[in-house]
């Protein structure tokens, strides 16, 4: 076959060659969150900036209403960082009061919604107990990994408590994906 | 062009096909930091090992004096981990003395300097309050994301306190970038 | 010097073109760990799920007995997250008892074993002191970077204490690699 002449002998080319600059890609950055209704026992989804500053979507990767829309099947690297900040967690207050010491926690989940499966799939989770001594605390949770996605899949970032998300700077809280 | 004949109809190839092994890439590892003058209100930049051990630069991605130099415009994945270590933070001392409890913090920033914008751009920031009970503490901050960079851009890693950086092992503190 | 401008000669193809969908890739997810013998002063290696749920291996990237096997030389992005959880660390108990305050710690290491070198190489390490106030704590350590690997190299993830690894969910603890 023409086009396979460059392939090293140990490897057959089954997939079309394609220019890297043409692959779906997105990097989304934090915006101030407007309180939205979310269902009980379901973490709220963050919404994002998709075109100002460092944010962009390209090559048919689109962002709409909290979701990154996957335009083409393939293996994607997906990542997010959420920076949380808060006042002293109840944990230490409870501790001082001698009550059971269940720590507070902060959690980030990257979730896939797909037509071919009725329930959302949790792709990545970062979860951390927060039991800080200081009166003000802040810390990031970073996630990133590769997943096989289908055209039409939707990705979102859910957090345990939207009010603790640091939305002040685009470099602190972000979400991205690119086709490998 | 030969090699483009397999392209699926939904996708025009606007960019030239190029061999993956020819793309600019670098992985830099920590070295002992020599105290350098840095200007007020500016976090100091780390310098790096670029050729010994696990470190390398290739395909026109060069390292010089704290900077990774971007040789070609495109979308890059950029990452860094900095491991910090220190003695008990002042935070807990302040707390014990009954004074206002402003926590210490550790911060990593990946910064872009570009000639198309007059001030450095903070691409990624990881910042964490440190208010440890233990007498010695250590922890990493990891960052990674994709950005559109221009030929001639320069990347550096800045930290809030260079004296807290663990420079003892190349696998603990590192900085890298590769063209997607 | 004029000759120091970036020449547009970067569009020459020096290496064979190859289809992206044909590259070695794997994403492995946590399973319950069976206690295994490990040598003194050597962190135990995790074993992984490689085909159920979110896990997969493809294009000659194979998983066997705790190791990812690298089928082709090149530059790989390697990543892992391990979520740890435990009861109050001894650190705070020791502190309360007035004994020397050496903090407990949690550590993840991504290790390469290669035929061409007698000792394993630590590629990435994430290590964190754990000195929690709360009675139950949990937190992730994330690592990711690019390395030049040789055909036949083997990758594994080692942890400081296998009993602290959260094996309950595939999105909390994972390990992956892909050829760039």
């Amino acid at each position: 076959l023409k086009g396979q002449e460059f392939a090293p002998s140990h490897q057959q080319v089954y997939a079309p060659l394609r220019a890297d600059g043409d692959k779906p890609r997105a990097h989304l950055t934090v915006v101030r969150q407007t309180p939205t209704q979310h269902f009980k026992n379901q973490f709220p989804a963050l919404h994002w900036e998709h075109e100002l500053g460092l944010a962009f979507t390209k090559n048919r990767m689109n962002y709409t209403n909290k979701f990154l829309l996957i335009p083409e099947s393939g293996d994607y690297f997906i990542y997010s960082q959420v920076t949380f900040r808060g006042m002293t967690s109840e944990c230490s207050e409870i501790r001082q009061a001698g009550r059971p010491n269940k720590p507070d926690s902060i959690t980030v989940v990257i979730t896939k919604v797909t037509d071919s499966y009725p329930e959302p799939t949790q792709l990545l989770m970062g979860t951390k107990s927060v039991c800080e001594v200081g009166s003000n605390w802040f810390q990031p949770i970073y996630l990133g990994a590769m997943f096989s996605l289908q055209e039409g899949d939707k990705l979102m970032v859910n957090v345990s408590d939207i009010s603790l998300v640091d939305y002040t700077k685009e470099d602190k809280t972000f979400f991205g994906a690119f086709l490998l | 062009l030969k090699g483009q004949e397999f392209a699926p109809s939904h996708q025009q190839v606007y960019a030239p096909l190029r061999a993956d092994g020819d793309k600019p890439r670098a992985h830099l590892t920590v070295v002992r930091q020599t105290p350098t003058q840095h200007f007020k209100n500016q976090f100091p930049a780390l310098h790096w090992e670029h050729e010994l051990g696990l470190a390398f630069t290739k395909n026109r991605m060069n390292y010089t004096n704290k900077f990774l130099l971007i040789p070609e415009s495109g979308d890059y994945f950029i990452y860094s981990q900095v491991t910090f270590r220190g003695m008990t933070s002042e935070c807990s001392e302040i707390r014990q003395a009954g004074r206002p409890n402003k926590p210490d913090s550790i911060t990593v920033v990946i910064t872009k300097v570009t000639d198309s914008y007059p001030e450095p751009t903070q691409l990624l920031m990881g910042t964490k309050s440190v208010c440890e009970v233990g007498s010695n503490w250590f922890q990493p901050i990891y960052l990674g994301a994709m950005f559109s960079l221009q030929e001639g851009d320069k990347l550096m890693v800045n930290v809030s306190d260079i004296s807290l950086v663990d420079y003892t092992k190349e696998d603990k503190t590192f900085f890298g970038a590769f063209l997607l | 010097l004029k000759g120091q401008e970036f020449a547009p000669s970067h569009q020459q193809v020096y290496a064979p073109l190859r289809a992206d969908g044909d590259k070695p890739r794997a994403h492995l997810t946590v399973v319950r760990q069976t206690p295994t013998q490990h040598f003194k002063n050597q962190f135990p290696a995790l074993h992984w799920e490689h085909e159920l749920g979110l896990a997969f291996t493809k294009n000659r990237m194979n998983y066997t007995n705790k190791f990812l096997l690298i089928p082709e030389s090149g530059d790989y992005f390697i990543y892992s997250q391990v979520t740890f959880r435990g009861m109050t660390s001894e650190c705070s108990e020791i502190r309360q008892a007035g004994r020397p305050n050496k903090p407990d710690s949690i550590t993840v290491v991504i290790t390469k074993v290669t035929d061409s070198y007698p000792e394993p190489t630590q590629l990435l390490m994430g290590t964190k002191s754990v000195c929690e106030v709360g009675s139950n704590w949990f937190q992730p350590i994330y690592l990711g970077a690019m390395f030049s690997l040789q055909e036949g190299d083997k990758l594994m993830v080692n942890v400081s204490d296998i009993s602290l690894v959260d094996y309950t969910k595939e999105d909390k603890t994972f390990f992956g690699a892909f050829l760039l």
Epitope: - | T114, S116, Y117, P118 | Q4
Partner: antibody, heavy 116, light 106 residues
Amino acid sequence: QVQLQESGPGLVRPSQTLSLTCTVSGFDFDDTYMHWVRQRPGRGLEWMGRIDPASGHTKYNPSLKSRVTITRDTSKNQVSLRLSSVTAADTAVYYCVRSGGLPDVWGQGSLVTVSS
Amino acid sequence: DIQMTQSPSSLSASVGDRVTITCRASQGVEYMYWYQQKPGKAPKLLIYGASNLASGVPSRFSGSGSGTDFTFTISSLQPEDIATYYCQQWEGNPRTFGQGTKVEIK
């Protein structure tokens, strides 16, 4: 305090090479980019080119590229401009400019007259 | 080259007046810069990234716009604002300036 100081001969003969040096202080030379901009009498501003002191990489205005060379000496914190084959049309105030770190800083300018 | 067309080339206004200068790029640019140059002096950066005020610049100066059309405004002209104002784009090679707008007091 950030300072840029241009220096060089104020008079250059036609067909000769104009040479100017910019000495910088008060900031980390490598952290920025250094440009040369000129302003001919009664005219607007014209960007000539820039150098990245960290790498030595340069970019030039295509209209001047065949005649202009910008170099740097990091040990002296200096950037130099050379413009060859000058004519009377090259008579101008030449400015050295820092970019990449706010504030954007300009030297006070150096008037160069091309005349026989 | 990206051509920068600045208008007007000169204007005369009274102290306290609102003054507006426009700059049109021949193709879209992400960032626009505005400089002030007083006679015999080097240009001084006033606005960067289309709308960010440089340090130490009075708040009566502002910038706006995106793509190809940008505006520079002095909300209340002061006697010390007598100068020539230039727009500049940094993205194309070469960097190009507008031809300048000379601002005078009536």
